[in-house]
């Protein structure tokens, strides 16, 4: 009764198509699969960035797989062949592992790469990234930004740089069609006559870095003798009302009365007859139903009432 064995996949490699972190893992079927013609061979693929404690694991019948990686670090991957138990009259048979690695050989000491990279997707419409030059680099150093997301044929270079002292320190992006809810890859590289400059890679999703405009049209409405309803409107732009959370800051007679977070464009406030002045401001943020993260907007203009008994009339600006 001979032991059933299977070879690992052949020609296992990681291919970089130039998408700044979106890589192809590909392989060929193992040698000597003739005995298992009736079988559907599967492959177990494990991969990770160097230094990560956990492997991502995929089981597939295909000869390729694609995923995003952090190109600031190396990548390691391993794959083996799986023969399901149906093919072997018993337990599943696994081949030995085939292994491969990939990394972009760096140029330059890490301190030369851009510092404090910050990207904001203003009002879900305009992407702007800014950075500071690397430590110890001279003014002749210039940085260039490239970006890619699924849907673009190839990586594109920034065409509208923000400059300071002749150096590129940021990028205003053009309209980015169908670019949210998918990984957005950026590389900032550099050049200098003086020394080699380290490239930096960044990956994020645009909906997670949205900074909305502040809410508008703040109003007061008397609901009852001891309640006032604060209302506002969503800012102009493409973000639907269902995507907003709000933070309100209410001041009564120069003392902070309430800070609250709400999901709707209203807030009901309990008041006393002694209140002489009431002011509030609101800011907005994309909520967990539309993104995993976000940036608070600036505060709205302040809306106040003062000088008349709050209990006597409806208050509108």
């Amino acid at each position: 009764d001979t032991e059933i064995k299977v070879n690992p996949p052949q020609d296992f490699e990681i291919v970089d198509p130039g998408y700044l972190g979106y890589l192809y893992l590909q392989w060929q079927p193992p040698l000597s699969l003739d005995h298992f013609k009736e079988c559907t061979v599967e492959y177990e693929l494990k991969y990770r960035n160097i230094g990560s404690e956990t492997w991502k694991t995929i089981i597939t019948k295909n000869l390729h797989y694609k995923d995003g990686f952090d190109l600031n670090k190396g990548i390691e991957a391993k794959i083996h062949t799986l023969l399901p138990w149906q093919c072997t009259n018993g337990s599943e048979v696994q081949s030995s592992w085939a292994e491969t690695t990939y990394w972009i050989s760096p140029q330059g000491i890490p301190e030369t790469k851009v510092q404090d990279m910050d990207c904001v997707y203003y009002n879900w419409q305009y992407l702007l990234c800014s950075w500071k030059p690397g430590i110890g680099v001279l003014l002749d150093t210039n940085y260039n930004l490239f970006y890619w997301y699924e849907g673009l044929d190839h990586a594109l270079q920034c065409v509208d740089y923000i400059k300071a002292d002749g150096q590129n320190i940021g990028c205003r992006f053009p309209y980015l069609e169908a670019s949210d809810y998918k990984d957005f890859y950026i590389c900032v590289n550099g050049s200098s006559e003086n020394k080699p400059i380290r490239s930096s890679y960044f990956t994020f999703q645009l909906q997670n870095i949205v900074k909305p405009l502040p809410p508008v049209y703040l109003t007061f409405t008397r609901e009852s003798s001891c309640e006032i309803k604060l209302k506002w409107s969503i800012p102009l732009g493409p973000i639907p009302a269902r995507c907003f959370d709000y933070e309100i800051e209410i001041r009564e007679d120069d003392t902070t009365l309430v800070t609250a977070t709400v999901e709707n464009e209203t807030y009901t406030l309990k008041t006393t007859n002694e209140t002489r002045q009431l002011c509030f401001v609101v800011r907005s943020k994309v909520n967990i139903y539309c993104s995993d993260d976000g940036i608070w907007s600036e505060w709205s203009d302040k809306q106040c009432w003062e000088g008349e008994d709050l209990s006597k009339k409806t208050l509108l600006r």
Epitope: G51, K73, S105, P106, Q107, G108, I109, P110, E111, P196
Partner: antibody
Framework: QVQLQESGPGLVRPSQSLSLTCTVS????????VHWVRQSPGRGLEWLGV???????DYNAAFISRVTMSKDNSKNQVFFRMNSLQANDTAVYYC??????????WGQGTTVTVSS | EIVLTQSPSILSASVGEDVTITCTAS???????LHWYQQKPGSAPKLWIY???NLASGVPSRFSGSGSGTSFTLTISSLQAEDAATYYC?????????FGAGTKLEIK
């Protein structure tokens, strides 16, 4: 397997120049940078500089006026030159491969004595 | 230049003991760029722990590394005779790249 081997003169006269060669095997110089590090009892491990896979260099500022690095990718060799040696340059000189921003393989080192 | 100060400079411990070596940086170092090397007499240094906490290939699991900012440690749980060596921390963050002065670990 990956190997690096330093070679050069064991003895250098004061004020003379030192030339070392690092011959590598098991990897390509077009894919990896190579650093030079020296070690002496008085000064410990000192980084001298690096030649990157693309051929550009970074030097320790303390040695920038005295050190030059170059390479021949086709011969798998990296060259190190240091001028104006003095007695305190006596050390073991190592070449080391750069991988993942660390020195993952080192040569066995070559001892250089500066003496008249 | 980032100065790395290791302590103690000499450490004597018995087989089976747990030992800790510390490395303090004069300014902050990214954990990705702090490494440890082991060197035995007559040999070149060997990469031992990379990026603060990742063991290099072939390093026994009794070794571990941790830390952030300016304070980093290498720990050996249950010291073995073959661990006798000098251990160096190294920062790859800023030029010039620098090493600690080393901790010589002796077996009692």
């Amino acid at each position: 397997q990956v190997q690096l081997q330093e070679s050069g003169p064991g003895l250098v006269r004061p004020s003379q120049s030192l030339s070392l060669t690092c011959t590598v095997s098991g990897f390509s110089l077009t894919s990896y940078g190579v650093h030079w590090v020296r070690q002496s009892p008085g000064r410990g491990l000192e980084w001298l500089g690096v030649i990157w896979s693309g051929g550009s260099t970074d030097y320790n500022a303390a040695f920038i006026s005295r050190v030059t690095m170059s390479k021949d990718n086709s011969k798998n060799q990296v060259f190190f030159r240091m001028n104006s040696l003095q007695a305190n340059d006596t050390a073991v000189y190592y070449c080391a491969r750069d991988r993942y921003d660390a020195f993952d393989y080192w040569g066995q080192g070559t001892t250089v004595t500066v003496s008249s | 230049e980032i100065v790395l100060t290791q302590s103690p400079s000499i450490l004597s411990a018995s087989v089976g003991e747990d030992v800790t070596i510390t490395c303090t940086a004069s300014s902050s170092v990214s954990s990705s760029y702090l490494h440890w090397y082991q060197q035995k007499p007559g040999s070149a240094p060997k990469l031992w722990i990379y990026s603060t906490s990742n063991l290099a290939s072939g390093v026994p699991s009794r070794f571990s590394g941790s830390g952030s900012g300016t304070s980093f440690t290498l720990t050996i749980s249950s010291l073995q005779a073959e661990d006798a060596a000098t251990y160096y921390c190294h920062q790859y963050h800023r030029s010039p790249l620098t090493f600690g002065a080393g901790t010589k670990l002796e077996i009692k």
